[in-house]
Amino acid sequence: IWELKKDVYVVELDWYPDAPGEMVVLTCDTPEEDGITWTLDQSSEVLGSGKTLTIQVKEFGDAGQYTCHKGGEVLSHSLLLLHKKEDGIWSTDILKDQKEPKNKTFLRCEAKNYSGRFTCWWLTTISTDLTFSVKSSRGSSDPQGVTCGAATLSAERVRGDNKEYEYSVECQEDSACPAAEESLPIEVMVDAVHKLKYENYTSSFFIRDIIKPDPPKNLQLKPLKNSRQVEVSWEYPDTWSTPHSYFSLTFCVQVQGKSKREKKDRVFTDKTSATVICRKNASISVRAQDRYYSSSWSEWASVPCS
Amino acid sequence: RNLPVATPDPGMFPCLHHSQNLLRAVSNMLQKARQTLEFYPCTSEEIDHEDITKDKTSTVEACLPLELTKNESCLNSRETSFITNGSCLASRKTSFMMALCLSSIYEDLKMYQVEFKTMNAKLLMDPKRQIFLDQNMLAVIDELMQALNFNSETVPQKSSLEEPDFYKTKIKLCILLHAFRIRAVTIDRVMSYLNAS
């Protein structure tokens, strides 16, 4: 058993049929010595008396808010949560496996630039009685500070018969140099509590590996005389690290119709303009990627050909 | 500790081309190592990230773009002084700071070159003959060093009398390649910045 936060405790249980469970001793936070009784949740049934209460925690029915009273007055609470371990593996029931970039990916993180700011998100099908707490650091043995905000519900989607909820959090490394060469990864830890179930999820990464620039901005077309060709130009996104001559991007320019199966024109360039063949009912799209360290491509910025 | 804006014209900057080749060569070599050594811990997640140049050179700080010198977090206290006469520079326009940056890059390359050559000598003794260093990568390191043209003491190649542990050598190769790729990215950024300034 360990303390998650004040008056909230996590009981780690090996979860299998007829498991013996864990013996837990609760102590009432009071100078009083006698006349103390214990109850669980909203029940008025007295579970025991005395300053301490010893319980055998085996299942979720044994978890919850234990309260010690004296003469009708509440003295203190202890909330017990369960963390299940099945076949030596901690449960991951609360969050959905996003399976990208690999299986067992519950947290996904992205950074728009090298400033040390990044966003992580996760998915769940649970809509109520759900809380998250996020901590982060650079390295784990001698951790350096990373400050994370509160996790918020950022999107809701319907997937077949299920609703899916996306939560996200923004974090900022306290003293980040955009030009630094990372040798210690960022660690992100998410505590998830659903009703009386506790789970924790972690992700470890270098900012350089989670870079995904914003799409290029200000796409403009200029038809070329006596030709099917069009000159398309764009600018670096505002959120990209500066100076751009140091933090350079490379671009992919594509002309394609509405369907992915349609024919297309595609060219890669390090410049902020390119010449492509425009077709009726097609769109010109441009996306960006760090020129020197191939992490993710940005989303496409698009303009119609016409 | 930063790069001034007054830097050479693009035409006078042959190092950019060499640094691009360097990044390409080390990336290819790392990819080859990951594939060949698939049953060794050779991915970014599996290895310890070590920097053999730590406390010996200060390339990131010495080559910091002017725009980032206002960022307190970028101003590390490490200082190293180097010989200052590089041929990638249009000499009259060169500042002391830029020479410091380029000589720091030169020292990095020299250190990695020695490590890689020592390692290759060990790998050549491996009866499995599983992996060797790409000669193209070693050649590209050499070309960039020549383009930088700094005179410095030659570092003797480390020779070891004991039997090499090939497993450890291959893991060390992965560690070195990962670190060198990150440094090659920095070098490429620096050359691009100098070329554009």
Partner: antibody, heavy 118, light 107 residues
Framework: QVQLVQSGAEVKKPGSSVKVSCKAS????????LHWVRQAPGQGLEWMGW????????EYAPKFQGRVTITADESTSTAYMELSSLRSEDTAVYYC???????????WGQGTLVTVSS | DIVMTQSPLSLPVTPGEPASISCRAS??????LHWYQQKPGQAPRLLIY???QSISGVPSRFSGSGSGTDFTLTISSLQPEDFATYLC?????????FGQGTKVEIK
Amino acid sequence: QVQLVQSGAEVKKPGSSVKVSCKASGGTFSDYYLHWVRQAPGQGLEWMGWIDPENGDTEYAPKFQGRVTITADESTSTAYMELSSLRSEDTAVYYCARNKELRYFDVWGQGTLVTVSS
Amino acid sequence: DIVMTQSPLSLPVTPGEPASISCRASQSISINLHWYQQKPGQAPRLLIYFASQSISGVPSRFSGSGSGTDFTLTISSLQPEDFATYLCQQSNSFPLTFGQGTKVEIK
């Protein structure tokens, strides 16, 4: 299986024209760009131009501009390349090639040898 | 026009050994470079597109690398059927242009 089948070899006199055909099978004809590329004996490849069979749009290499015409007939899934004012240096194998991507070629015809000789 | 220069023009290789062919562009073409194999009397066959992207059905011993002006096609271990001419092609701008070809011959 996508295939491009070209017309047979031709012998032409200098100053005349030649029209080579390229019939496509497998896949929808208008879903692909179609190019013509030639190869003189013992020489490299030389791109001549492309057509979008969907709308008849064409683009020609400046070297052949005014002398080459690429057309397409959707009803027969056939593309044509006509080269006029032939000279001896036009002796080459002429290939048609196609792709959904405009700028490179994933399927090629077998080639048509055009010999220009007086 | 962008001029593509291949080297060497002829490359004698022992079967089973690796081979590397170089292609250089007269100006930077990013990764807009494609590789083809051509055997005598046959049409070219696409091997690699956009410098390093592999084609399904092409053996994994063929790989490509490079960007900007310098590109390499590598055959990790030459098989008897690999003795042919290899051509690079740029697609950075029209007109599309090809290298003059590298003939890989049996040593």
